[in-house]
C-alpha cells in the first residue's frame, strides 16, 4: 500500500503591485495532481511581517491571496498543499512547505525618514496629514506623499502640499470617494542631493482618525424644580447622529465641575434652587458603533445661564 504524497505549490511568491503595502501572495498548482482530480485540493497559507510573533493562517482553494502589510518591515510567508481526508480514504495529507520572503530594500538611514506623522480626517470630510522632516536632513530634502486604497487604479501623489521653508511638511487630500472602512495606505518618500532618504509606510482606516466639529446650538430647559435639561445639536456635516458620543463639562457657580459622557444630544442635570450660575461646554467624538477609534472635537462655545429664575429661561447660543 503506497504512501500518498503531494507536492508543494510551485512558484510561490509575494508580488508588490505598487499599492504601498497591499500585496499579492500567489502560487501555481503543485505537479502531479492527476490522482486527485476528482478532489478539491486546498492550500494552507501562513504569513506575517518579520518580527511579528504570530502568523496569519488562511486555508483557500484559490491560487492567490491579498492582504495588507507594513512595508517598513520585511514579510515572510509559507504555503503547503492539503489533501482533505476525503481524497485519501483516511487522514489529511500535507505537502512540505514552500517559503518566500519580500522586503523593500531600504535607502538611507532610519533618521532621514519623516518624523511625527499625524493624520486627521476632519469631520469625516477632509484628510490632512502632517509630518516633520527627518533628523539632520538638509533643506534641499523634499518629501513626497503617495496614497492608495481599494478602488483606486494606482497609487496617487499628493497634489496639495503644506510647505514650510520650501519643504513639504504635510498634505491636504482631495475628496476621497468611498475611502472609509478599508485600509488606507500611505508612503512618504524623499529625495536629496546630499544623501538617500528612507521611505516610511503608514496604514490606517479613515473612520478611525475622524475629528468631528464641536456640537452647536447649546440650550437650557427647566424640566422641574431640581432638574435642568441641557441640549445641543449635532455638528454640521456628513456624520449621522447615531455615530456620536459626547463629553460635557458643566460648571455650577464656578465651583462644582461635572463631566459626563453621553450618547444623546441631551443631558439632565440635577440642581438646587441655590444655583446662581450654570455653564457648560460639549465636545463630540465618533463612537464605537461607527469606528474603532477617534479624536475628540474641540470644545463647543461655552453656554451660560446667570440669574434667579431659570424656569423662565431657555437660552440659545
Amino acid at each position: 500500500d503506497t504512501e500518498i504524497k503531494v507536492n508543494p505549490p510551485q512558484d510561490f511568491e509575494i508580488v508588490d503591485p505598487g499599492y504601498l503595502g497591499y500585496l499579492y501572495l500567489q502560487w501555481q498548482p503543485p505537479l502531479s495532481l492527476d490522482h486527485f482530480k476528482e478532489c478539491t485540493v486546498e492550500y494552507e497559507l501562513k504569513y506575517r511581517n518579520i518580527g511579528s510573533e504570530t502568523w496569519k493562517t488562511i486555508i483557500t482553494k484559490n491560487l492567490h491571496y491579498k492582504d495588507g502589510f507594513d512595508l517598513n518591515k520585511g514579510i515572510e510567508a509559507k504555503i503547503h498543499t492539503l489533501l482533505p481526508w476525503q481524497c485519501t480514504n483516511g487522514s489529511e495529507v500535507q505537502s512540505s512547505w514552500a517559503e518566500t520572503t519580500y522586503w523593500i530594500s531600504p535607502q538611507g538611514i532610519p533618521e532621514t525618514k519623516v518624523q511625527d506623522m499625524d493624520c486627521v480626517y476632519y469631520n469625516w470630510q477632509y484628510l490632512l496629514c502632517s509630518w516633520k522632516p527627518g533628523i539632520g536632513v538638509l533643506l534641499d530634502t523634499n518629501y513626497n506623499l503617495f496614497y492608495w486604497y481599494e478602488g483606486l487604479d494606482h497609487a496617487l501623489q499628493c497634489v496639495d502640499y503644506i510647505k514650510a521653508d520650501g519643504q513639504n511638511i504635510g498634505c491636504r487630500f482631495p475628496y476621497l470617494e468611498a475611502s472609509d472602512y478599508k485600509d488606507f495606505y500611505i508612503c512618504v518618500n524623499g529625495s536629496s542631493e546630499n544623501k538617500p532618504i528612507r521611505s516610511s509606510y503608514f496604514t490606517f482606516q479613515l473612520q478611525n482618525i475622524v475629528k468631528p466639529l464641536p456640537p452647536v446650538y447649546l440650550t437650557f430647559t427647566r424640566e422641574s424644580s431640581c432638574e435642568i435639561k441641557l441640549k445641543w445639536s449635532i455638528p454640521l456635516g456628513p456624520i449621522p447622529a447615531r455615530c456620536f458620543d459626547y463629553e460635557i463639562e458643566i460648571r455650577e457657580d464656578d465651583t462644582t465641575l461635572v463631566t459626563a459622557t453621553v450618547e444623546n444630544e441631551t443631558y439632565t442635570l440635577k440642581t438646587t434652587n441655590e444655583t446662581r450660575q450654570l455653564c457648560f461646554v460639549v465636545r463630540s467624538k465618533v463612537n464605537i458603533y461607527c469606528s474603532d477609534d477617534g479624536i475628540w472635537s474641540e470644545w463647543s462655545d461655552k453656554q451660560c445661564w446667570e440669574g434667579e429664575d431659570l424656569s423662565k429661561k431657555t437660552l440659545l447660543r
Epitope: 511568491e13 508588490d16 501555481q28 505537479l31 495532481l33
Partner: antibody, heavy 118, light 107 residues
Framework: QVQLVQSGAEVVKPGASVKLSCKAS????????MSWVRQAPGQGLEWVAT????????YYPESVKGRFTITRDNSTSTLYMEMRSLRSDDTAVYYC???????????WGQGTLVTVSS | DVVMTQSPLSLPVTLGQPASISCKAS??????VAWFQQRPGQSPRRLIY???YRYSGVPDRFSGSGSGTDFTLKISRVEAEDVGVYYC?????????FGQGTKLEIK
C-alpha cells in the same frame, strides 16, 4: 479583453543582441506568469522562457539558457526577452503568451519575426 | 525532457466528418496537457487545458481526453474554419514541450 501586443520585426547579425517586448492589457498583469514561444520558418512550436507573475522565478530550456533573459515590468505591464549571441538557428517568429492559473498558455501575442542573418 | 509525439502528422478530413489526433508523452504528465490550434498565418489559439477542459469560447465540437501518457483531441464534425495545425503541449515539468503538430486539411 486580454491583449498582448508585441514589438516589430528585427533583423540582426549573428552574435548580436536584441530585446523583444510584449505589452499586455485587459488583465492584472502581475497575477500571471508569462512565456515566450518561438516558431522557426515552416516548423513547430518551441518553448523558450517562462517568468512567474512577480518575476521571482524564471525557466529556460538548455538551448537558450545563458543567452536569453526573460524579464517583466509590472508597473507598465510589459514582458521582455533579451536575446544575446544570436545564431542563425534562432531565426523564428517569437510569440509571447500568458500562463493561465493552471499553467497552460491561454492568450498569445501576434508574434515578432526575428531574422538572424549575415 | 518529456517528448510529445503526435500522430498523424497530416490529417485529411471530409467536411462534417469527425477527426481524431493522438498525442503520446514519453513519461507520465498526469493531466497537464493543453491543445492549440494554429490557423495559417495566425498565432496559436487555445483549445483545451488539463487534458479535457475546453476554454470558454471554444466550440463544443472540440473535446479532449486522456491522462498519464496518452491524450486525444477529437473534432466531432470538421468545419472549414478548422483547417490548420494542431499542437499538444505538456506543462507538467520544465522544459515545457510541444508535439510536432498535426496538419488538418479538407479532403
Amino acid at each position: 479583453q486580454v491583449q498582448l501586443v508585441q514589438s516589430g520585426a528585427e533583423v540582426v547579425k549573428p552574435g548580436a543582441s536584441v530585446k523583444l517586448s510584449c505589452k499586455a492589457s485587459g488583465f492584472t498583469f502581475s497575477s500571471y506568469g508569462m512565456s515566450w514561444v518561438r516558431q522557426a520558418p515552416g516548423q513547430g512550436l518551441e518553448w523558450v522562457a517562462t517568468i512567474s507573475g512577480g518575476g521571482s522565478y524564471t525557466y529556460y530550456p538548455e538551448s537558450v539558457k545563458g543567452r536569453f533573459t526573460i524579464t517583466r515590468d509590472n508597473s507598465t505591464s510589459t514582458l521582455y526577452m533579451e536575446m544575446r549571441s544570436l545564431r542563425s538557428d534562432d531565426t523564428a517568429v517569437y510569440y509571447c503568451a500568458r500562463r493561465d492559473l493552471r499553467s497552460a498558455m491561454d492568450y498569445w501575442g501576434q508574434g515578432t519575426l526575428v531574422t538572424v542573418s549575415s | 525532457d518529456v517528448v510529445m509525439t503526435q500522430s498523424p502528422l497530416s490529417l485529411p478530413v471530409t467536411l462534417g466528418q469527425p477527426a481524431s489526433i493522438s498525442c503520446k508523452a514519453s513519461q507520465n504528465v498526469d493531466i497537464n496537457v493543453a491543445w492549440f490550434q494554429q490557423r495559417p498565418g495566425q498565432s496559436p489559439r487555445r483549445l483545451i487545458y488539463s487534458a479535457s477542459y475546453r476554454y470558454s469560447g471554444v466550440p463544443d465540437r472540440f473535446s479532449g481526453s486522456g491522462s498519464g501518457t496518452d491524450f486525444t483531441l477529437k473534432i466531432s464534425r470538421v468545419e472549414a474554419e478548422d483547417v490548420g495545425v494542431y499542437y499538444c503541449q505538456q506543462y507538467n515539468a520544465y522544459p515545457l514541450t510541444f508535439g510536432q503538430g498535426t496538419k488538418l486539411e479538407i479532403k
